[in-house]
């Protein structure tokens, strides 16, 4: 039996970006009908992971796993009924805590992003890596790139593959 | 506010192993009072990740994230009451599906382990990587090594850091 996952296409895109595998990223983006400007924006983020080397991929994977398996994702506010939990917690939707992190990565300040990461994983090496990645993204991406990345994320979150 | 996570020390150890960072692994193992034979066992697993290169680290991170954010981990069987859910789903305990995967990685056959991974992430490249890692671990680790790895996992699961 194949288990339902929370928004598998999001994790496929995230790990293709973090892995530096441009071919897998392209393929994943094709599945959500990404435009050329949206692809360009994601590839700029991918470049930051590649330039920052292996450590950034592994540490950011650790952050993503930690957030995805946190209390925040495992039952947002402990809903009042099991019926609510069935609807709200156990669907395939991406967890709001993951969404928040991605939004801050694109639109927040480095301090805001690092502060949010620190809520989940406070290892100094993780926070340093988060700041390096955030600074790289801010340097590489124009406002238009960031808007394109956000519009792509909306496509991902609303995709039937999520 | 620092969020509670599901067994943070487990993920610290997993990502130190997958990252190939022996210093971080040693530090994490010191925190759970690992014995020398337990350290040796974990370093043999780490060697497999290092030998298999970057792709194995990223892909295994994807598997771990997928399982950790799966329905299995987000509410094992949808408990009957919110009280139960508070106790069983939203604590800091490691998710049983993650435990099962780690146990099979050490004690199962390659087919059993790959079959369990396939329930969560059926990408051919992921399954091939899982098999390579499993075969490597079976070749490197003696039965005694595996027993030491399992005893270390018990320490991790019962640690106050979990």
């Amino acid at each position: 039996v194949k288990m339902a996952e929370t928004c598998p296409i999001f994790y496929d895109v995230f790990f293709a970006v973090a892995n530096g595998n441009e071919l897998l990223l392209d393929l994943s983006l094709t599945k959500v009908n990404a435009t050329e400007p949206e692809r360009t924006a994601m590839k700029k983020i991918q470049d930051c992971y590649v330039e920052n080397g292996l450590i950034s991929r592994v540490l950011d994977g650790l952050v993503m796993t930690t957030i995805s398996s946190s209390k925040d994702c495992m039952g947002e506010a402990v809903q009042n009924t099991v019926e609510d939990l069935k609807l709200n917690t156990l669907g395939r939707e991406i967890c709001p805590a993951v969404k928040r992190g991605v939004d801050l990565f694109l639109t927040g300040t480095p301090d805001e992003y690092v502060e949010q990461v620190a809520q989940y994983k406070a290892l100094p090496v993780v926070l340093e890596n988060a700041r390096i990645l955030k600074n790289c993204v801010d340097a590489k991406m124009t406002e238009e790139d960031k808007e394109n990345a956000l519009s792509l994320l909306d496509k991902i979150y609303t995709s039937p593959l999520c | 506010v620092k969020m509670a996570e599901t067994c943070p020390i487990f993920y610290d150890v997993f990502f130190a192993v997958a990252n190939g960072n022996e210093l971080l692994l040693d530090l994490s193992l010191t925190k759970v009072n690992a014995t020398e034979p337990e350290r040796t066992a974990m370093k043999k697993i780490q060697d497999c990740y290092v030998e298999n290169g970057l792709i194995s680290r990223v892909l295994d991170g994807l598997v771990m994230t997928t399982i950790s954010s799966s329905k299995d981990c987000m509410g094992e069987a949808v408990q009957n009451t919110v009280e139960d859910l508070k106790l069983n789903t939203l604590g800091r305990e490691i998710c049983p599906a993650v435990k099962r995967g780690v146990d099979l990685f050490l004690t199962g056959t390659p087919d059993e382990y790959v079959e369990q991974v396939a329930q969560y992430k059926a990408l051919p490249v992921v399954l091939e990587n899982a098999r390579i890692l499993k075969n490597c671990v079976d070749a490197k680790m003696t039965e005694e090594d595996k027993e030491n790895a399992l005893s270390l996992l018990d320490k991790i699961y019962t640690s106050p850091l979990c």
């Epitope: 441009e22 990223l25 983006l29 050329e36 | -």
Partner: antibody, heavy 118, light 107 residues
């Protein structure tokens, strides 16, 4: 107009090597993933390998993994498929194709025939 | 790896006939499927992408449908120039695989 032109095919002995090239024109080469697809005489199509546009990430079919390497030179708008440890079952027409979004083979070359025989 | 099957393996039809080819995947591939035409002695040509989207410049008599594991390719009115072999191909993930092909000729 998009054009893809393969070259380098020929007769080679089992165990031997060959390098195929594909010269591309009529589009921004580095913006597209590219692929090789082969067709054994009288048989169907078989995907061989794909390579991404800028950084050259590659994936291969299991049947050629470890024997074939795929590279590109974006400054020359050219692809290279290095075939080594060739076997009789590698005998085929090799097509290079543009891979839109890494998924759709929207333009194809005319193919180059590789024959592996003693 | 994902296996693709096609049926029929060959068919003969008259000019103007409606022709239908099916393609089946051995696991769910969503709509990640393309259709190609290969005329004798020529390179293949993309007709349909993402299960149902007509490639630019392809005549509207060609269409595709389906999702999950079962897909259909249709020529609404067969023309002499449609004599060819037709292949489906998935792109759910690497490795990509093609169906074995369906050979279409004129009665």
């Amino acid at each position: 107009e998009v054009e893809l032109l393969e070259s380098g095919g020929g007769l080679v002995q089992p165990g031997g090597s060959l390098r195929l090239s594909c010269a591309a024109s009529g589009f921004t080469f580095s913006s597209y993933a590219m692929s090789w697809v082969r067709q054994a005489p009288g048989k169907g199509l078989e995907w061989v390998s794909s390579i991404s546009g800028r950084v050259g990430s590659t994936h291969f079919a299991d049947s050629v993994k470890g024997r074939f390497t795929f590279s590109r030179d974006n400054s020359k708008n050219t692809l290279y498929l290095q075939l080594s440890s060739l076997r009789a079952e590698d005998t085929a027409v090799y097509y290079c194709a543009r891979s839109r979004g890494a998924a759709y083979f929207d333009y194809w070359g005319q193919g180059t025939l590789v024959t592996v025989s003693s | 790896d994902i296996q693709m099957t096609q049926s029929p393996s060959s068919l003969s039809a008259s000019v103007g006939d409606r022709v239908t080819i099916t393609c089946q995947a051995n696991q769910d591939i969503s709509n990640f499927l393309n259709w190609y035409q290969q005329r004798p002695g020529k390179a293949p040509n993309l007709l349909i992408y993402a299960a149902s989207n007509l490639e630019t410049g392809v005549p509207s008599r060609f269409s595709g449908s389906g999702s999950g594991t079962d897909f259909t390719f249709t020529i609404s009115s067969l023309q002499p120039e449609d004599i060819a072999t037709y292949y489906c191909q998935h792109y759910d993930n690497f490795p990509f695989t093609f169906g074995p092909g369906t050979k279409v000729d004129i009665k």
